[in-house]
């Protein structure tokens, strides 16, 4: 008789990333026998939403349905239909809702409101939508990462499953960056957390984890950018801004309403002028990096050590995994090997900032202008953020990795995210039944 | 500002293939859909299908099955519409077209100039 | 496939005037509560230009003498005050389901 293959008991989960800069959104998928197994839950899609971020639709909120529908609809398409009704959908909004909430309770509400009314209308299981803290964000990201690499798993291998494994259970630390907002997750060497905001307890899969995490709200790589033109504009002597961290020969005129629209270049405000000014490129790395460095307070701290802006930082411990666009920057600049030390790095943001922008555009024809220009200033900013932001070391460097996809799941807050709302990550150790691995029934 | 340049008219013989090019410039592909439209003489306006070029998923009308193929190349910023089996009433006007949302959630629509095929033994 | 009827399919008007298109789908176009109906306005020898999309939603640099409503099956594009830049062939477009179709055009023309 032939063998027939047995129905796949699978389930789904769809997690909406909802960014400052643009949302995606992220299906998983797993055996439901194994639910509570670690590392089985997997990502088979990643749909990103054309347009930018849910925030910047505060003044046309009826038309959020509409953004959201070809990734809905891809959902629908991949997801089977006899799993619709039991398949989860999540929809966390991260620093860009923040900075809305900060100016208007009432605007994010109401474009929260229209999302859940949009997420409503489809065949899934819509579980809600809400702005998640700066701490959620860092530990969800944190759990992510080190799922995905099995370090929560209690077997040992001999043999290494995933990149970056070195097949002992130290966990990672987690380095993301945003658009709106970066942070930094790790578990400290026995080092008490002296600010409790920034102390997380687990227990997970029968282990306790005493966690260190912070959002850096206003220092994600595009409200970075804003602040540091703010600052650069109040000492400008006329409307050109001459700017070291934009390649020579770049100029973009940029609105003064639009320099002062975020929360984030309030501390800068000042009245001016004029409405308008240009940036006028120069491409000059270190002066891009000195004017970055400006950004960051380290004149205070009141605890044993910070990281800036008086924030506790204790001392960075074991590996770390840098995503989101920590990876997208520095895979972009080609940086993203092993092998490159952090001399070499700034060796070769040197040269890239200095090129001329009409090369740059050249050796880049398919990359977006507004993306490409921001390249210098981007790559700039993540070696200054993590040398003296968060005070890694040329010797340290080598334990920063930046990450991607893990066993193909994008790295990022959402599968910790999706894991923990489904209750997949139990704190106990699960009691392995004879037939929970086997691979035949 | 934003470009669509499609490649030249194409006068061609019924049975064969032909590929007309879309040339992107001033925008990147990935961050929206690209349709292709076309109208045949004196005749309205007919939906061929459209391709998500991050992925490359396309969807068409099911009349082309089996002789479109809808594709995009990203590095290039172009999107290719390739028909074969070609007929005489494949004769019009080839369109692409983005719509979509800007970084500003403003509501945009760029077409190409047209690329006239003539299918004709 | 859904079905697009437009009328009337020729409609002679004067500047100043309002001008009145219909759409009637052969079944809803609407679904997760958007109508996914389209307008575009053509000028000869030249490329389609949307004006409305989901049935009521300006496109970018449209003027607001353009307007949009309907739902279901029943959709109407409103141009009032009308210009003389305004006399061209005016589609329907529902992006429902594929394929997306098209109505078969409304020549607006100077009275």
């Known amino acids: 008789t032939q063998n027939k293959a047995l129905p796949e008991n699978v389930k789904y989960g769809i997690v909406l990333d909802a960014g400052s800069s643009h949302t995606s959104l992220y299906i998983y998928k797993w055996p439901a026998e194994k639910e509570n197994d670690t590392g089985v839950v997997h990502q088979v899609e990643e749909c990103r939403v054309k347009g930018p971020g849910i925030s910047k639709f505060v003044q046309k909120v009826n038309e959020i349905g509409i953004y959201l529908t070809d990734c809905m609809e891809r959902a629908r398409e991949v997801i089977p239909r006899s799993q619709h009704q039991e398949t989860p959908v999540y929809l966390g909004a991260t620093a860009g809702m923040r900075l809305l909430r900060m100016e208007s309770e009432e605007l994010a509400d109401r474009v929260l409101d229209v999302v859940e009314r949009s997420l409503s209308n489809y065949p899934f299981d819509f579980q809600g939508a809400r702005i998640i803290t700066g701490q959620e964000e860092g530990a969800y990201g944190w759990i992510t990462i080190n799922y995905l690499l099995g370090k929560f798993s209690q077997k040992t291998r001999w043999f290494s499953i995933v990149p970056y494994e070195t097949n002992n259970q130290e966990t990672f630390g987690a380095l993301d960056l945003g658009g709106a907002s970066t942070q930094v997750t790790f578990v400290p060497q026995n080092q008490t957390i002296e600010s409790p905001d920034n102390a997380l307890q687990f227990r997970l899969y029968g282990k306790d984890y005493n966690v260190y995490t912070h959002s850096f709200l206003c220092y994600g790589k595009d409200q970075a950018l804003w602040q540091k033109l703010a600052k650069d504009i109040q000492v400008a002597s006329n409307e050109i801004l001459r700017d070291p961290c934009f390649h020579p020969g770049y100029k973009k005129v940029v609105n003064v309403s639009d320099l002062y629209k975020t929360p984030c270049t309030k501390r800068f405000e000042m009245t001016l002028p004029f409405q308008q000014f240009e940036i006028q490129g120069i491409g000059n790395y270190q002066q891009c990096h000195q004017s970055i460095l400006e950004l960051f307070n380290t004149s205070y701290c009141p605890y044993s050590q910070c990281a800036f802006n008086g924030i506790f930082l204790p001392p960075l411990q074991g590996d770390f995994g840098a995503f989101s666009a920590f990876y997208f920057v520095m895979k972009f600049l080609n940086l993203t090997s092993e092998k490159v030390s952090q001399e070499k790095v700034t060796e070769m943001m040197k040269k890239f900032c200095a090129q001329p922008w009409e090369e740059i555009k050249t050796s880049y024809a398919g990359v977006k202008e507004k993306y490409l220009s921001e390249y210098c200033f981007s790559g700039t900013y993540i070696l200054s953020l993590l040398l003296q932001g968060y005070h890694f070391t040329a010797d340290s460097w080598e334990h920063i990795h930046f990450i991607g996809k893990i066993q193909g799941s994008d790295a990022g807050w959402t599968l910790g995210y999706m894991l923990n709302l489904t209750n997949m990550i139990p704190a106990e150790q699960p009691l392995s039944t004879p037939l929970s691995h086997s691979t035949y029934v | 500002q934003v470009q669509l340049l499609q490649s030249g008219a194409e006068v061609v013989k019924p049975g064969a293939t032909v590929k007309i090019s879309c040339k992107v410039s001033?925008?990147?592909?990935?961050?929206?859909?690209v349709h292709w439209v076309r109208q045949r003489p004196e005749r309205g306006l007919e939906w061929i299908g459209k391709i998500d070029p991050a992925n490359v998923n396309t969807k068409f009308d099911p009349k082309f099955q089996g002789r479109l193929t809808i594709t995009a190349d990203t590095s290039t910023d172009t999107a290719y519409l390739e028909l074969s089996s070609l007929r005489s009433e494949d004769t019009a006007v080839y369109y692409c077209a983005l719509y979509g949302y800007d970084d500003d959630a403003y509501y945009f629509d760029y077409w190409g100039q047209g690329t006239l095929l003539t299918v004709s033994s | 496939d859904i079905v697009l009827t437009q009328s009337p399919a020729t409609l002679s008007l004067s500047p100043g005037q309002r001008a009145t298109i219909s759409c009637r789908a052969s079944e809803s176009v609407d679904n997760y509560g958007i109508s996914f109906m389209n307008w575009f306005q053509q000028k000869p020898g030249q490329p389609p230009r949307l004006l409305i999309y989901a049935a009521s939603n300006q496109g970018s640099g449209i003027p607001a003498r353009f307007s949009g409503s309907g739902s279901g099956t029943d959709f109407t594009l409103n141009i009032h005050p009308l210009e003389s830049e305004d006399f061209a062939v005016y589609y329907c477009?529902?992006?429902?389901?594929?394929?997306?179709?098209f109505g078969p055009g409304t020549k607006l023309e100077i009275k």
């Open positions: 477009q529902q992006s429902k389901e594929v394929p997306y179709t």
């Open positions: 001033g925008f990147s592909i990935k961050d929206t859909y």
